[in-house]
């Protein structure tokens, strides 16, 4: 029980060390204020006094999913919960990815000099492209986008006539332009990709990171339509710059990217010189708030950069475009299709104190961690929630930016579910009604939540006693402890006030009143109480677990003597004088064990003397110093000196016999034997 | 209007005693405690001790433990301190004051003050 | 016990000018601490409470500031009233402990 061993000053320090802690405010209460609930009730705390963190989950916005609408859709899409730190919560999730959803597919393509045939190639795939689009949706648009790198040194050549016109029959260097935002007009797209002309720059790595940015976050220029699928194809046959690589040290330009929207009223992106590019999180995460799929198109050249960099975008494509992008087509349909059938949902905007894992029955997940859908069904997927106690060594309620925030559980292709998320790390309010120095702390101290707080130099239950110096907890400390009253309890003014209603007691709480002897599981066999460690008995018992009548009735014999005078009566049992001749009950005589062989040395004699068979048989019995009689009921085994029985092997029945007397076989002893043996069936 | 009044200034013998008393009007007597302080000719002001008039328990600074005794008289809003064995260093000014069951706010009202006088 | 230094013990000064008196404690007293002023017809009345909060009726020139050990009152501008003996006292532990006074007279 972590509550109770948690070294605990206040009720808000209680609460906050376990999710299970509880508080008691009881002024009467004398036990430990921190423990759980339910112990708490059963040291005798009021439930009202009790102060808990109650944990809250509520779904504020739930449309149930539609699977006649041909969009995606996520179910519930708002809720609120608070948790206590270390606690968890389990919720559902519907998702549902319709079989047919409108795409937005927009091609960013790289613009430097290399890039020529590709561009021609494209140039004549357009009517190619549209067909391929047509075969997986009926609702799609189509945009297209450019770019190079900076136009700044080291990327660029700055030379006047250069920027002009970098290569022969080329286009000035730029960053990066939306050429055509996204349009179902097919043919708009063709005849405007007709008089691109291609461009160039002087380092090989592109500013392609740059434009993948600006077409996440400029969702009006581009013209993302909410519910529709978000496919960017990058184009390249080049690495890429990223956040910090050393070219833009170079260049002079040192900003982070502010990650918004620059571009001006002809599409071309304007702060290439004061920004730097982004990183590669920064893209993963701006792509996943916008609902943006990746497929990059790369050729043999450069595929082993995006090989890694592809793995970090949780759905995504890559594959190998051919020299002059002739299999770009082939590559899209490839692509889409992969992607159609895996569905990432992860948690954006999370507070570090707070920890989001979704699970699926009815899904496998991927190597990536997406799961495989099947598409037209509702998917059901378990989210669990929990709210961490420590963040790097610290608990989690000293850090409060880490504390809540809007959690965004989103799936690749929709808006997703918004978390209003947080732990809870109140105060106890009634740590906010503390009676400032109060009469019933001696006005040495605050009363707070049911106990006194005590002014430095003051202790107590109600702050009276002067404390000074550690010579005040010595009368507490038994010799060789190191805790005051063993723990199991307050030092108060120089003696020791236990815990536990009574169930410590002593000078320093060292007897521990659950811990007397027991007897079948009872303390003190139930017929006592435990006091100083020690058994107290009722009336009537004594013994060190109170297991010992004082009554002599067990012991009384038939005859309505002790022990048949053979023995004394000592905690309700006979001792016997000559234990090993006596039954251990009440002292009568146990012939067995005066005579361990007698039936042995009775058996041949009987059965030559009865039933003429046996070792003696065909000698006379005349050796057997002792009389048999033949009897039809032999007397119970109690009743008797022995009683035993053989069997014959002549005729294979079991005979039976007892002594009587004092067990000394002789003249005067007879053996009574039963007339009738104990044949088996059919002999 | 809040007041508490305080007896006339006494002039005693060394060894005697002498009882002072302090009356409480315009609030409720039982509603707070009620404190002793003494403050010797040109010296700075002393805790005595305080009494809660609803119970009667006391509670004593250790310097004047055997020599105030409070107690009160709740039927006419009085407080009472008794100072015995009474010798010169016992001459002062004594006041009384109220102080809240709790709270920021210690001593809000005070009384005139009584000088004690011991001389042969 | 808790010591209450008081300085200065008397202090000479003019009408409208800005005093300040200090006052600090043998040990933290978590701002538990009252100024009261003695006229000299021996009647007290409290000025400030908990180290900074007016008491109801005192004019808006008096006040007092300090945390830990060390606290202060201030008059603003010195009114005729004014000049009178003025005591700190820490309610924080008892014994409830007054410090030594300072004196406040006209120049």
């Known amino acids: 029980n972590r509550c109770k061993k948690a070294p605990v000053k206040s009720c808000t320090e209680c609460v906050r060390v376990d999710k299970d802690c509880a508080y008691c405010t009881d002024e009467m209460f004398r036990d430990r204020r921190c423990n759980t609930q339910a112990e708490l009730l059963a040291a005798g705390c009021q439930r009202e006094s009790i102060v808990v963190m109650e944990s809250s989950f509520q779904i504020t916005e739930e449309t149930q999913i539609d699977t006649t609408l041909r969009r995606s859709q996520m179910s519930p899409q708002g809720l609120r919960v608070r948790l206590r730190p270390g606690e968890e919560r389990h919720f559902e999730l519907e998702v549902f990815e319709p079989l047919e959803s409108p795409v937005d597919l927009y091609i960013l393509m790289d613009f430097s000099n290399s890039m020529s045939d590709d561009l021609d190639n494209l140039k004549k795939m357009g009517q190619n492209l549209a067909r391929v689009l047509s075969q997986l949706t009926s609702d799609y648009t189509i945009g297209f986008g450019k770019f190079v790198d900076k136009v700044s040194v080291p990327q660029t050549d700055m030379r006047p006539e250069k920027l002009k016109e970098p290569w022969p029959n080329s286009d000035p260097p730029f960053s990066f332009k939306n050429v055509i935002s996204l349009t179902e007009d097919v043919d708009e797209f063709r005849n405007k990709l007709q008089g691109e002309r291609i461009s160039g720059n002087l380092d090989a790595p592109e500013g392609g990171f740059d434009a993948i940015l600006q077409t996440a976050v400029c969702t009006r220029d581009i013209g993302w339509r909410p519910d529709s699928t978000h496919l960017l194809v990058f184009s390249t046959e080049s690495a890429f710059h990223y956040e910090a690589d050393g070219a833009n040290v170079l260049a002079g330009i040192m900003s982070r990217n502010d990650e918004r929207c620059h571009l001006d009223t002809t599409g071309t992106y304007t702060q290439y010189r004061t920004q730097d590019y982004p990183s590669v999180p920064t893209l993963v995460r701006l792509l996943a708030k916008h609902n943006i799929i990746p497929i990059f198109a790369v050729t043999n050249y450069s595929y082993s950069y995006y090989e890694k960099l592809h793995t970090y975008f949780p759905v995504s494509s890559l594959g190998v475009l051919q020299e002059d992008s002739s299999n770009i087509v082939e590559l899209l349909e490839e692509a889409f299709n992969r992607i159609r059938s895996n569905l990432d949902i992860r948690a954006l905007d999370s507070p570090r104190g707070l920890r989001t894992e979704v699970t699926s029955k009815m899904f496998q997940k991927t190597r990536t961690g997406s799961f495989h859908i099947r598409r037209g069904e509702v998917g059901i997927y378990q989210v669990q929630l929990r709210a961490l106690e420590h963040v790097d060594g610290t608990h989690v309620c000293q850090l409060p930016e880490d504390q809540k925030g809007n959690i965004h559980l989103k799936p690749s292709f929709s808006d997703g579910l918004k978390m209003d998320a947080g732990i809870i790390c109140d105060v106890c309010t009634c740590e906010l009604q503390k009676e400032v120095r109060s009469a019933r702390c001696s006005f040495n101290g605050d009363f707070v939540c049911g106990q006194c707080v005590c002014s430095e130099g003051w202790s107590g239950q109600t702050c009276n006693c002067s404390t000074g110096s550690l010579s005040d907890i010595q009368p507490c400390l038994r010799e060789g402890e190191d805790k005051p009253c063993s723990g199991r309890g307050e030092c108060q003014c120089g003696h020791c006030v236990c815990y536990g209603e009574g169930r410590y007691e002593g000078q320093f709480c060292e007897y521990d009143n659950f811990q007397c002897p027991r007897t079948s599981g009872f303390l003190c066999n139930d017929r006592g109480r435990c006091s100083m460690g020690q058994c107290v008995c009722e009336p009537g018992w004594t013994g060190p677990s109170c297991d010992c009548p004082l009554s002599n009735a067990t012991c009384i014999d038939s005859n309505g003597g002790i022990c048949n005078g053979r023995g004394h009566c000592e905690c309700g049992r006979c001792h016997c004088h000559q234990q090993s001749l006596y039954t251990d009950t009440i002292c009568e005589i146990n012939y067995s064990a005066i005579h361990p062989g007698l039936c042995e040395d009775l058996r041949s004699c009987v059965q030559c003397q009865a039933w003429g068979t046996g070792e003696k048989k065909g000698r006379t019995c005349e050796e057997c110093n002792f009389k048999v009689k033949m009897v039809d009921e032999l007397k119970r085994a109690e009743e008797v000196v022995v009683r035993c029985s053989f069997r014959d092997e002549d005729d294979d029945c079991t005979y039976s016999y007892t002594m009587e007397g004092d067990g000394a076989p002789g003249p005067n002893s007879t053996v009574l034997v039963h007339k009738k043996k104990d044949c088996p069936p059919g002999s | 209007q809040v007041n508490l009044l305080q007896s006339g200034a006494a002039l005693v013998k060394p060894g005697a005693s002498v009882k002072l008393s302090c009356k409480a009007s315009g609030y409720t007597f039982t509603d707070y405690y009620i404190f002793w302080v003494k403050q010797s000719h040109g010296k700075s002001l002393e805790w005595i001790g305080y009494?809660?008039?609803?119970?009667?328990?006391?509670n004593y600074n250790e310097k004047f433990k055997r020599k105030a005794t409070l107690s009160v008289d709740k039927s006419t809003n009085t407080a009472y301190m008794e100072l015995s064995r009474l010798t010169s260093e016992d001459s002062a000014t004594y006041y009384c004051?109220?102080?809240?069951?709790?709270?920021?706010?210690?001593?809000?009202?005070w009384g005139q003050g009584v000088m004690v006088t011991v001389s042969s | 016990d808790i010591q209450m230094t008081q300085t200065p013990s008397s202090m000479p000064a003019s009408l409208g000018e800005r005093v300040t008196i200090s006052c600090r404690a043998s040990?933290?007293?978590?701002?538990?601490l009252s100024w009261y002023q003695q006229n000299l017809d021996g009647t007290i009345k409290p000025l400030i409470y908990?180290?900074?909060n007016l008491q109801s009726g005192v004019p808006s020139r008096f006040s007092g500031s300090g945390s830990g050990t060390d606290y202060s009152l201030t008059i603003s501008s010195l009114e005729p009233e004014d000049f009178a003996m003025y005591y700190c006292?820490?309610?924080?532990?008892?014994?409830?402990?007054f410090g030594g006074g300072t004196k406040l007279e006209l120049k």
């Open positions: 006292q820490q309610y924080d532990s008892s014994p409830w402990t």
């Open positions: 908990y180290t900074s």
């Open positions: 040990r933290g007293i978590n701002n538990y």
């Open positions: 009494i809660n008039p609803n119970s009667g328990s006391t």
């Open positions: 004051t109220r102080r809240a069951y709790y709270g920021y706010n210690p001593f809000d009202y």
